[in-house]
Amino acid sequence: FKVATPYSLYVCPEGQNVTLTCRLLGPVDKGHDVTFYKTWYRSSRGEVQTCSERRPIRNLTFQDLHLHHGGHQAANTSHDLAQRHGLESASDHHGNFSITMRNLTLLDSGLYCCLVVEIRHHHSEHRVHGAMELQVQTGKDAPSNCVVYPSSSQDSENITAA
């Protein structure tokens, strides 16, 4: 399987909420002996490999934000962490995997990485990640709502998030 990032860039005004999304593509084994470990973290550009550096999101580590479940299950981070930090990572039955950040500030700007590890019973692992940029803007140049830019080079038209 692969991980797709529907949008490579999110431009949002301060105070807005945003949901960053990744999607599992290709055949996803939903067998009993397969589980998926999913998490989010911040990283930085200009490295040899994107997403190799694992920095916290609003002081929450990749362990705090992880989801661990069978291939056909939905999952969410703890309500307690979501409430306290304005963050929630979630995964649905259709391969969508997201993190919602509430009340954005300029400090939230940066590169975000989603990671999916497919774990087969006894040993083998398949690890893939996706990356996307969040730009939080303030002042008169800031958009009134989040504007998202598709990753696909063919589809360069801006989409305004609802």
């Epitope: 190799s52 550096e53 580590t61 362990q63 590890v117 006894h122």
Partner: antibody, heavy 117, light 110 residues
């Protein structure tokens, strides 16, 4: 790859004490490390963890009693004010966070701290 | 708070026999459970991670199972060298932890 603890000794209660864990072949900027202790004849007790991003978490009983920090080559465990209950062997250990199993795949040999008046 | 309860505290088993050790987490730990073997004067040795995956070089006589809050380590065809104390450890969370390790089970081989 290896880790080794040092600094364990006999101290009186309240005496400042810091243990050091020196790593070899391990990049502390990309690895997650932990301290675990074991009182004589007792079980393993998790003290806390320091992430590659420098974020630290402590066991509920250890909060305020210890501070974990790191440099590029060492992970330190600082005792706030040792008591006789802190007499134990202290292990430095590495978490497997690239296989995302969060098991401890590398342990040091341990260093003995004795707190006695 | 995350806490691990391990039973029994000690178990006696004959050579060739089978011993079962249980570990219960205070909350769901989503299979992020490891088992360790420790002999007197030595550092712990990783046996099993993610509840059921055997660590490199570990005998297949060791088997881990379980899910949710309840996990089991089974040692079959017990040998004299298996005499040790065994510990479980949860890796699901580092927040609000009382102890990530179970209290240990001493296995005595007759």
């Amino acid at each position: 790859q290896s880790v080794e603890e040092s600094g364990g000794r006999l101290v009186t209660p309240g005496t400042p004490l810091t243990l050091a864990c020196t790593v070899s072949g391990i990049d502390l900027s990309t690895n997650v490390m932990s301290w675990v202790r074991q009182a004589p004849g007792k079980g393993l007790e998790w003290i806390g963890i320091i992430f590659d991003s420098d974020i630290t978490y402590y066991a509920n009983w250890a909060k305020g009693r210890f501070t974990i920090s790191k440099t590029s080559t060492t992970v330190d465990l600082k005792f706030t004010s040792p008591t006789t209950e802190d007499t134990a062997t202290y292990f430095c250990a590495r978490y497997d966070t690239y296989g995302y199993s969060y098991s401890i795949d590398l342990w040091g040999p341990g260093t003995l701290v004795t707190v006695s008046s | 708070a995350y806490d691990m309860t391990q039973t029994p505290a000690s178990a006696e088993v004959a050579v060739g026999g089978t011993v079962t050790i249980n570990c219960q987490a205070s909350e769901d730990i989503y299979n992020l459970l490891a088992w360790y073997q420790q002999k007197p004067g030595q550092r712990p040795k990783l046996l099993i991670y993610r509840a059921s995956t055997l660590a490199s070089g570990v005998s297949s006589r060791f088997k881990g199972s379980g899910s949710g809050t309840d996990y089991t380590l089974t040692i079959s065809g017990v040998q004299c060298d298996d005499a040790a104390t065994y510990y479980c450890q949860q890796g699901h969370s580092s927040r609000n932890v009382d102890n990530a390790f179970g209290g240990g089970t001493e296995v005595v081989v007759k």
